[in-house]
Every structure is written in C-alpha cells, then in structure tokens.
C-alpha cells in the first residue's frame, strides 16, 4: 500500500480468482483513542472499533471511503484504490490502446517544434467517475523539471456504438535548448482513476522523435505565362523554431486529382517554392519535414489549382 | 526518403555537400545495424545515449546560432578553445566563434573516426562475419575532415590485445551510430546555417 | 471453490458452426479477464482468444481471427466461443481458463472436424 | 507455429536432477515473466511455477523456476516416476499482451 495523495491510498492487488489479498491497517488520524467507530462510503454498517481498523482487501467491495468516527463527529477519511496486477502485468482498463505507432500505445505525444513544449493525448470509453493527473521530467535516475498543465477533455468522437473521449496535456521542458542534443528522454507518467480502480500509464520519448510541424503556411498559386504550369509558394509555419536556417524544414508538394485514383504528381524540395503543373479541379498541397531528422510530417496545407 | 529531391546549391559553402552526404551515409548505416542486428538492443528505445565527445568537444555551445545565444539554457559551457585554421571558412571575416565551431566539428569526426576503425577491426574478426562498417561512410568522414582542413594530431588507432567480445562490440556499434547520427545532425544544421549567413 | 466447466464440443463437418460454453463458479466471474485455449491431439497448447472482463476488449490468435467470436455473460456466468467456417485444423481439445498468476482451468471439451 | 522453444525431451533416472530450457526474445520473456504447466496425458495444464521462480501452495518443493534475459528453466530435482509428463513454458510478448505464448513441449520420461 501506498499513498497517491493525502487521505488517499492505492493497494496493490495479484488479480486471480480465490487470491488472498492484501491485509491493510487504517489508523484514525486522531489524538483521540476510545471510542472511535468506522464505516465504508455510506453506509453506517460499523465494521470495527479502535483507532485502527485491519481489513483484508481482495476486490473492489473492500475498497472505498472509510471514515472513522467518534460520537457522531468524522474523525477522518482514508480513500482505498486498487491497482490490479494481472499475471505480472499492471492492468490497463481505463486507457484505449492507440496502437499507433505500435500496439500497447496508450499515450501519445507531439511537439511543433524543439522549445521543449510538447502536448500529450490519450483516449477513453469512460465518461464519468474518471480523473487524471500528470508528471513528467527530462530522465528518471536525476530527474530534470518538466512541467505539465492539468489533462483536459479535449475531444468526443462516436466510434460504432461507443463514444470515445479523448483527453490531452501540454507540457513543457523547464529549461530546454532547441540546438541541444538529448541524451535523456522525456518521461510522461499519467494517474488515472476511475471509480476505485488506479491505473498509471507511462511514455518515454526525445522530443526529435515526437515532432510534427504545423502545415506549412501563406500557401500561393502563381500562374506562369503562356504555360500550364504554376509557382507555388509558401512559407515556414510560425510556430517552428528559429533559426530557419538552422532548423531547416524540407516540403513535399502534392497535386492531386479530383478522384482520389488518380494519380499524384509528388515534388520533394528543400526551397519554399515549387513550379507544377496544375490539372482542372484538381488541388496542390505542401506539407512539411525537418529536413535533417525524419521524424513526421506535418498535415497537408492545401489550394485549390482553379 | 527515396525519392527525387530538388537539392539546393551548396554554394559557396564546400562542407555543407559533404556534411549532407554524411548524415546520409550514417542513417544508412544505423537502419542497416537495426536491421542486420534484429536480435541486439539496438532500438533508440533500448539503448543507453552516450556521446564520446562528450568534456572533449563542444560541437553545441560552439556552433549555436547568434539567435539562440540569448537563450541561457543553451549556454552551459562555452570555454573550450579550438585551432582555427578551418578551409571550410569562406571569408576572411569569419568570427573566432565559427573557427571555434568548426573546430569542434572536426575533433567530433576524428574522434568517431578512430572508434569506427577500431570497431570495423573487432568486427573483421567475428566469425559470425554479421556486420561492417560501410566504407562509404568512412570515406565520407574522411572527406568532411579534408575540407575543414584542420591541423591536428593524429590519434592512434587504439588496439586491443584480448579476444574481442562480439556481443558487446555490435550493442556498442548501435550506441556508436545512434549518437553519431545525432552529431550528423547537428553538423548538418551548422553547416546549413554558416551557408545562409 | 473456482469451477470451469466447458460444453458443446462434438463431431462437425468443416465448414460449418459450434458454440463452445464455459460456465464459471466459485469466484466472481465479472472481475476476471478469461481465455480460451486449444490443444490438437499429440501437439502442444495453443491460445485461441482473451476477453476482458467487461467484454470490451477481445484479442485473437492470428489462424482464428475473422472466424471466432469470444463472448461472455456476466449475468449467467458464462465465457462462450463461437466457432464458424470449421477447418480440420481446428481439431482439438478447447479449454477455458482465468486470467491471472494463478490460473484455474477447465476439463477441456473436444471439437472433431472431419467430414 | 511457437516463438518460445523449449527441448522436445528430456530424461532421468529416479532421484536424477533434469533441467528444462525455454528460450525467447528481449519482447517475450525478455520482458514479461514467465510460468511452468505440467500436463498429465488426458488432463489439463497443471501450474506449477509462476512469476518465473514462484511455486502455488501444494507444489512440491522438487520444482524450481528461474529466468535470465531472455531464456527461462525449470529444474525438477529428486525425479519421481509421476513426474513423467508433457511441460510448458508460457510468458507474453509486451506487443501482443494479453494472448499467451506457449512453449513448443517438453516430454519429460523417467526412466526406469
């Protein structure tokens, strides 16, 4: 057993059929010592008296709010949450796999640019009863100060017959270069309660392996003369880093049909600007790379050619 | 990304060619190690990040940008002085700042150069004969290290005389590449900034 | 006492269907993920399929996917598989087991795929 | 087709020590723990050793479990005529969690 919060413990369970539990002795955080009468959540069931109270907790039923009392007056209040270990295995019921970019991907993380700010995300079927709480730092032996903002609900979508919640966080690096190169990743570890149950979910990442421009932005069409061909021109998103000409981006330009079975012309260019031929009713998007550590490209900024 | 690229002229600027073509040639070699090496902790996940040139070098702190130099967090130490007779340096007022930088660069080669060897060596003499070093990348070191033309002892190329142990030196081939991409990087992103400036 | 019992194996033609129960006593069955696992005579034990304990997760061994439903109702303490489109591969003994450290097993039931 | 190999058959005399390998990767047992079935013909799987070196109460103390990196054993010492049975390895890959990875058998004979 250990102590998530003030007033707030977790016990760690071996999850199987018949298993023992855990034995737990609450004690009554008061100076006083006759007396005193405790119950769980709301009921006025008396399950013991003193000022501890030993329980043996197996599942969810020995879990909850017990209150000690003493003459109709709440002494105090110590929360017990479960934390299933299933065959060895931490239980992961509160999170949905994201099984992108691999299976057992509950978090998922983004940054724009090498500030050291990135956002986090994660997604649920359960709507109510659920609360998070979010750590991160640079390492985990000496840990270095990250700091995180609370996870809010960030979108709901209808998957099927399900709904699905996605909830995300925006962190930042205390004290980050973008010129640095890491050498300790980034750990995230995320709380989540629902109910009575305690899960924590964790991801490790550099923050080079996580980035994603934003699109590239200002994207321009201009005719050249007596030709079928155009100048396509854009520029750098605002919120990539500085210098451009250290942090250089590559473009990938696009022109793309009305059908989606029609062929695309692909251009890749380190420049902001690309002549192409444009088609009718057809669409030219750029999108954008770090040009020197491959890690994703951003979303299509896109015009029509018309 | 194996594909047509539309590549800028190098220009002025010779290094910013070959500095190109060596992070080309590591990525190269890292996704072939990865690939070859399936069996060893090998993965940028499961493998410890150690920089060898690290107290020797200061690749980072020299070669920051003048933009980023207000930023604190970038200057830990900046105290490390280099020679600075660098042909790389495309006119004659070339700051110290620079030659320092492109010092720097050029211990940072010579020193992956001499643990490349040294590895390729062990390596010969597996007979599970599983992986070398392409000598591609080899000689394009080389060639980034002519161009910056900077004098400089030569470091022995070190020897062992105990019986390699193969396991080891292919986890400490992968830990090898992954912190020299991140070097290439680095040095590609320099180069490209002392070409636009 | 945990109790699993598993029911519906027999003799069917390939191609065709059988519903595979597995009833469950002794424990509460709504807190406990539960698998399904095969062994064809003289060979070794294969997994077939998990459910969590809510039913809202259902994971497959790849020879099974697309053919094999597992189910449960927690009401009537039941863990079930729907097998469709039999192959004569799929001869085997069928267990039903819990999910945990320690494990309680079924007696097995036997499905026989053969025309 | 099983990515934990185990040998297809061991043998001993009564009283002998004999020792059963099962050898994964760095993403099963590399990462997981591991578990030990004995399965009498006719009879389901049989746990007798979990959370790689841990024995349920009423396994005799003959049966041991180990692991390191990536490989796992089981070690039955003072074998017993009854110990002649099918044995299982079983861990999970950290990507396909929760399915079950079953080594290939062993066939444990003792001999008379």
């Known amino acids: 057993i250990w102590e998530l919060k003030k007033d707030v413990y977790v016990v760690e369970l071996d999850w199987y059929p018949d298993a023992p539990g855990e034995m737990v002795v609450l004690t009554c955080d008061t100076p006083e010592e006759d007396g005193i009468t405790w119950t769980l959540d709301q009921s006025s069931e008396v399950l013991g008296s003193g000022k501890t109270l030993t329980i043996q907790v197996k599942e969810f039923g020995d879990a909850g709010q017990y209150t000690c009392h003493k003459g109709g007056e709440v002494l105090s209040h110590s929360l017990l949450l479960l934390h299933k270990k299933e065959d060895g295995i931490w239980s992961t019921d509160i999170l949905k796999d994201q099984k992108e970019p691999k299976n057992k991907t509950f978090l998922r993380c983004e940054a724009k640019n090498y500030s050291g700010r990135f956002t986090c995300w994660w997604l649920t079927t359960i709507s109510t009863d659920l609360t998070f709480s979010v750590k991160s730092s640079r390492g985990s032996s000496d840990p270095q100060g990250v700091t995180c903002g609370a996870a809010t609900l960030s979108a709901e979508r209808v998957r099927g017959d399900n709904k699905e919640y996605e909830y995300s966080v925006e962190c930042q690096e205390d004290s980050a270069c973008p010129a640095a190169e890491e050498s300790l990743p980034i750990e995230v570890m995320v709380d989540a309660v629902h109910k009575l149950k305690y899960e924590n979910y964790t991801s490790s990442f550099f923050i080079r392996d996580i980035i994603k421009p934003d699109p590239p932005k200002n994207l321009q069409l201009k005719p050249l003369k007596n030709s079928r061909q155009v100048e396509v021109s854009w520029e750098y998103p605002d919120t990539w880093s500085t210098p451009h000409s250290y942090f250089s981006l590559t473009f990938c330009v696009q022109v793309q049909g009305k059908s989606k079975r029609e062929k695309k012309d692909r251009v890749f260019t380190d420049k902001t600007s690309a002549t192409v031929i444009c088609r009718k009713n057809a669409s030219i998007s750029v999108r954008a790379q770090d040009r020197y550590y491959s890690s994703s490209w951003s979303e299509w900024a896109s015009v029509p050619c018309s | 990304r194996n594909l047509p690229v539309a590549t800028p002229d190098p220009g002025m600027f010779p290094c910013l060619h070959h500095s190109q073509n060596l992070l080309r040639a590591v990525s190269n070699m890292l996704q072939k190690a990865r690939q070859t090496l399936e069996f060893y902790p090998c993965t940028s996940e499961e493998i410890d990040h150690e920089d060898i040139t690290k107290d020797k070098t200061s690749t980072v702190e020299a070669c920051l940008p003048l933009e980023l130099t207000k930023n604190e967090s970038c200057l830990n130490s900046r105290e490390t002085s280099f020679i600075t007779n660098g042909s790389c340096l495309a006119s004659r007022k070339t700051s110290f700042m620079m030659a320092l930088c492109l010092s720097s660069i050029y211990e940072d080669l010579k020193m992956y150069q001499v643990e490349f060897k040294t590895m390729n060596a062990k390596l010969l003499m597996d007979p599970k004969r599983q992986i070398f070093l392409d000598q591609n990348m080899l000689a394009v070191i080389d060639e980034l290290m002519q161009a910056l033309n900077f004098n400089s002892e030569t470091v022995p190329q070190k020897s062992s005389l105990e019986e390699p142990d193969f396991y080891k030196t292919k986890i400490k081939l992968c830990i090898l590449l992954h912190a020299f991409r991140i070097r290439a990087v680095t040095i590609d992103r320099v180069m490209s900034y002392l070409n636009a400036s | 006492q945990v109790q699993l019992v598993e029911s519906g194996g027999g003799v069917v033609q390939p191609g065709r269907s059988l519903r595979l129960s597995c009833a469950a006593s002794g424990f509460t069955f709504s807190s406990y993920g539960m698998h399904w696992v095969r062994q064809a005579p003289g060979k070794g034990l294969e997994w077939v399929a998990f459910?969590?304990?809510?039913?809202?997760?259902?994971y497959y061994a790849d020879s099974v996917k697309g053919r094999f439903t597992i189910s449960r109702d927690n009401s009537k303490n039941t863990l079930y598989l729907q097998m469709n489109s039999l192959r004569a591969e799929d001869t085997a003994v069928y267990y039903c087991?819990?999910?945990?450290?320690?494990?309680?097993w079924g007696q097995g039931t036997m499905v026989t795929v053969s025309s | 087709q099983s990515v934990l190999t185990q040998p297809p058959s061991v043998s001993g005399a009564p009283g002998q020590r004999v020792t059963i390998s099962c050898s994964g990767s760095?993403?099963?047992?590399?990462?997981?723990?591991v578990k030990w079935y004995q399965q009498l013909p006719g009879t389901a799987p049989k746990l007798l050793i979990y959370?790689?070196?841990q024995r349920p109460s009423g396994v005799p103390d003959r049966f041991s479990g180990s692991k390191s990196g990536t490989s796992a054993s089981l070690a039955i010492t003072g074998l017993q005529a009854e110990d002649e049975a099918d044995y299982y390895c079983?861990?999970?890959?950290?990507?396909?969690?929760?399915?079950?990875?079953f080594g290939t058998g062993t066939k444990v004979t003792v001999l008379a």
């Open positions: 087991k819990t999910h945990g450290s320690h494990d309680n």
């Open positions: 079983q861990s999970y890959d950290r990507y396909t969690h929760p399915a079950l990875l």
């Open positions: 959370y790689n070196d």
């Open positions: 459910i969590r304990y809510d039913g809202s997760n259902k």
């Open positions: 760095r993403s099963n047992i590399g990462s997981n723990t």
